[in-house]
Interface confidence: low
């Protein structure tokens, strides 16, 4: 969106000015600007910041907007993720397999076959848990085969995600304890896909991926991450730069415009028919008539 003021020109203030286009911008920023007429060919070659010309307009990457994708957005949507994950670090002892040095080598055929069997067994064990995603073996060691592995869980994001995952981790503990108690070697014979040592089952650690708006904001802002912050309104996080109006960190550029660049937010001051404006926040007005007489 381009706003035109017939009698207003913009002039850069000292050092590195960066400007956010529209002082009343909202989190939703237009990503495209249509161009008609003879100048369009020229515009096509000038799309900035990774923008691409589609024949009519510059299509801008997420962080940018404007006719030439020259403007950095002042607000980034950091709505909650679709899913939240949890990882349980577990150790079980498999007694039905003899340990060999080859099992230490994750690219060996022995390891691959063991991994396939173990994964298949765990898929059966955890089959009733909707949040179960799979297992990931991290290490195999001697004694018969001590399997250090992660059980991966995932659930759709809801405000209750923590309770859902907490419940799932409890069910995982119950099921692995049950199977390692039931599937055991009898007279050195294993009648199941895998057998376990009842006393070799341990849960070391449970990690639930936290929904971290600050981290999401920093990542999505990429090289501008140092200047974007998260502020909350009605418990909803907003990832904003100081160029977004209406927040506690908002930069007041008075009659000027705030613009973001690699080196941070700065005010771009305007010149009207009657005044020049200057200063870090464009708060110093000089009447032209006083200069020109």
């Amino acid at each position: 969106r381009t706003t035109s003021f017939p009698t207003v020109t913009t002039t850069a203030v000292p050092t590195n000015t960066t400007i956010k286009s529209n002082p009343t911008s909202t989190p939703t920023v237009p990503r495209t600007t249509t161009c008609f007429g003879d100048g369009c060919q020229n515009t096509a070659s000038r799309c900035k910041n990774g923008g691409t010309w589609d024949g009519l307009k510059c299509q801008c990457p997420n962080l940018y907007y404007g006719e030439l994708c020259e403007e950095v957005v002042s607000s980034i949507d950091i709505g909650p993720p679709e899913t939240i994950s949890a990882q349980m670090e577990l150790t079980v002892t498999v007694t039905s397999v003899k340990f060999t040095e080859e099992l230490k080598n994750h690219s060996s055929q022995e390891f691959q076959e063991f991994k396939q069997t173990f994964t298949e067994q765990m898929n059966i064990v955890y089959s009733g848990i909707p949040e179960y995603v799979g297992v990931n073996i991290t290490k195999l060691r001697l004694g018969s085969v001590v399997v250090e592995h992660d059980v991966l869980l995932r659930t759709k994001y809801t405000p209750e995600y923590k309770t859902v995952l907490d419940n799932a981790t409890e069910v995982v503990k119950e099921k692995i304890t049950k199977v390692t108690t039931q599937q055991i070697m009898i007279n050195d014979i294993c009648s199941d896909m895998m057998c376990f040592n009842t006393t070799g089952t341990q849960v070391q650690n449970i990690t639930v991926t936290q929904y971290d708006p600050e981290e999401d904001c920093r990542k999505m802002a990429k090289e501008y991450g140092d200047y974007f912050v998260v502020e909350y309104r009605d418990q909803k996080p907003y990832c904003i730069s100081p160029c977004e109006p209406g927040f506690s960190v908002s930069k007041n550029c008075n009659l000027g415009k705030c613009q973001m660049s690699l080196s941070g937010p700065q005010c771009l001051c305007v010149t009207t028919e009657t005044h020049w404006y200057s200063g870090e926040t464009c708060n110093q007005g000089t009447q032209k008539s006083l200069v020109y007489g």
Epitope: T15, N16, K219, K222, D226, L262, S263, Q266
Partner: antibody, heavy 120, light 113 residues
């Protein structure tokens, strides 16, 4: 420990293309931009551009806009720089470099360099 | 584009003496919001990749000896090696990390006298 390992030296004829690879390890590949810088024999350093592994967005120095293509393969943590329509003045050592944490603009880690020779 | 001009092109200094390399930018690299200057210095030895020494004009990279220091503000910057060691013989480059495209100085070759 961060490591950027580049592909081997190349000899190309004028007009041809070259694709240099840079395999990253020792850090979270998708958080950092990957930059490319070149250095002609006995000359200074020249920034070509950068790409971001999370979404493959790339940013090029205008000088290389029409000839350089930067890509990434997240599955192998490898970045690529392809330069087309080669000319003799493209003879240089090409470096991939990783920026310092929290910045995309100065370089904490560098690949060992790939010498590209353009000669008829 | 911001043009970076280094001087001198080459410099010969005796062991233990002070070496001073200058770098001038065509526009200010000072960010008035945080009062940081967006300039870095690199060292490149023959046949090696560049090595980061200093960023933000004066912040020494971890592991860099304290005989290396950076100073300056706005458009004029200096890299100083307080007491030259034999291993400091190299080419030194300044680089602005203020705006794209990122640009480097042409380099200063530091030799032993």
């Amino acid at each position: 420990q961060v490591q950027l390992v580049q592909s081997g030296a190349e000899v190309k004829k004028p007009g041809a293309s070259v694709k240099v690879s840079c395999k990253a390890s020792g850090y979270s590949f998708t958080i950092y931009w990957m930059h490319w810088v070149r250095q002609a024999p006995g000359q200074g350093l020249e920034w070509i551009g950068m790409s971001h592994p999370s979404d493959s967005e790339s940013r090029l120095n205008q000088k290389f806009k029409d000839r350089a293509t930067l890509t990434v393969d997240k599955s192998t943590s490898t970045a690529y720089m392809e330069l087309s329509s080669l000319r003799s003045e493209d003879t240089a050592v090409y470096y991939c470099s990783r920026p310092y944490y929290g910045s995309s603009a100065w370089f904490a880690d560098w690949g060992q360099g790939t010498l590209v020779t353009v000669s008829a | 584009d911001i043009v970076m001009t280094q001087s001198p092109d080459s410099l010969a200094v005796s062991l233990g003496e002070r070496a001073t390399i200058n770098c001038k930018s065509s526009q200010s690299l000072l960010n008035s919001s945080n009062q940081k200057n967006y300039l870095a210095w690199y060292q490149q030895k023959p046949g090696q990749s560049p090595k980061l020494l200093i960023y933000f004009a004066s912040t020494r990279e971890s592991g860099v000896p304290d005989r290396f220091s950076g100073s300056g503000s706005g458009t004029d910057f200096t890299l100083t090696i307080s007491s030259l060691q034999a291993e400091d013989v190299a080419v030194y480059y300044c680089q602005q990390h203020y705006s794209f495209p990122l640009t480097f100085g042409a380099g200063t070759k530091l030799e032993l006298r």
